[in-house]
Amino acid sequence: AVNGTSQFTCFYNSRANISCVWSQDGALQDTSCQVHAWPDRRRWNQTCELLPVSQASWACNLILGAPDSQKLTTVDIVTLRVLCREGVRWRVMAIQDFKPFENLRLMAPISLQVVHVETHRCNISWEISQASHYFERHLEFEARTLSPGHTWEEAPLLTLKQKQEWICLETLTPDTQYEFQVRVKPLQGEFTTWSPWSQPLAFRTKPAALGKDT
């Protein structure tokens, strides 16, 4: 690895996964690197192999236990290191004291389904995945609907400022194909960010009844 701009960013999914991305300009693609996690008050250590995701960045997931197990708390600090093999030894390339509940990114919401659809309205529900019970109801959501002829980037964001795992979309056009996505964010954490968007849910509004005003 060479000297260059380096960045080491990790997020905790609030249960049993820390996902990390390491980027370094000028680093060699075929260099063998890993992330090592060393908690300050736990008996376990964990390692994952960094795999290339682009020309100068690598990513890996530290799997700390069963997906729904609560492996870390708000008082934990985990020292995270990027180690790269240089000849016969491992060299530390980056290091940070990681506070899991200050760096949260939850899993994307799952199980999206149409609860009820009409000509102009659609009620959709979803579930959150692998989210800590510590949050209680302190979560918020963003949702977006893809209309025909538009892109996701153009879709207006709908904000749900509470833990509400459903939405009623209104003012839709009859007999029209739409797609819907949602993402979640805990209110806690200085560096907390939005989850990835959910898988899109496709749905179609009902056609208008013949001979009636719409």
């Epitope: 960045q7 080491f8 020292t79 290191r81 491992w90 530390v92 390339m93 980056a94 290091i95 004291d97």
Partner: nanobody, 126 residues
Framework: EVQLVESGGGLVQAGGSLRLSCAAS????????MGWFRQAPGKEREFVAA????????VYVDGVKGRFTISRDNAKNTVYLQMNSLEPEDTAVYYC???????????????????WGQGTQVTVSS
């Protein structure tokens, strides 16, 4: 490669003071944190103190807090360890170390450091 040369060690009575210096040369632009470690006879090398590139962050092992102060002068590429109220238990060879690792921790380990000095002997007599 980075070269490190320590100086300032010696024999001192308990309660006395010493100031260790560590001069860095070579690829000093690549240095991030610098630290001091020590190794007493028959014991493993242990972390003493570290300082960030800017000097804004420092960390000490519990046994030296309040007695030792680490500082750095980037213009001179030198790091210092001011040791006050020395105790016989502080007797050891003191090593300066530098790391190119990006970032900061309060839990430095020997393996985090790439470059090492030859060490300077500190002996505290009772």
């Amino acid at each position: 490669e980075v070269q490190l040369v320590e100086s300032g060690g010696g024999l001192v009575q308990a309660g006395g003071s010493l100031r260790l210096s560590c001069a860095a040369s070579g690829r000093t632009f690549s240095i991030n944190a610098m630290g001091w470690f020590r190794q007493a006879p028959g014991k493993e090398r242990e972390f003493v103190a570290a300082i960030s590139r800017s000097g804004g962050s420092t960390v000490y092992v519990d046994g030296v807090k309040g007695r030792f102060t680490i500082s750095r002068d980037n213009a001179k590429n030198t790091v210092y360890l001011q040791m006050n109220s020395l105790e016989p238990e502080d007797t050891a060879v003191y090593y300066c170390a530098a790391t190119m690792a990006v970032g900061w921790t309060t839990r430095w380990r020997t393996a985090d450091f790439d470059s090492w000095g030859q060490g300077t002997q500190v002996t505290v007599s009772s």
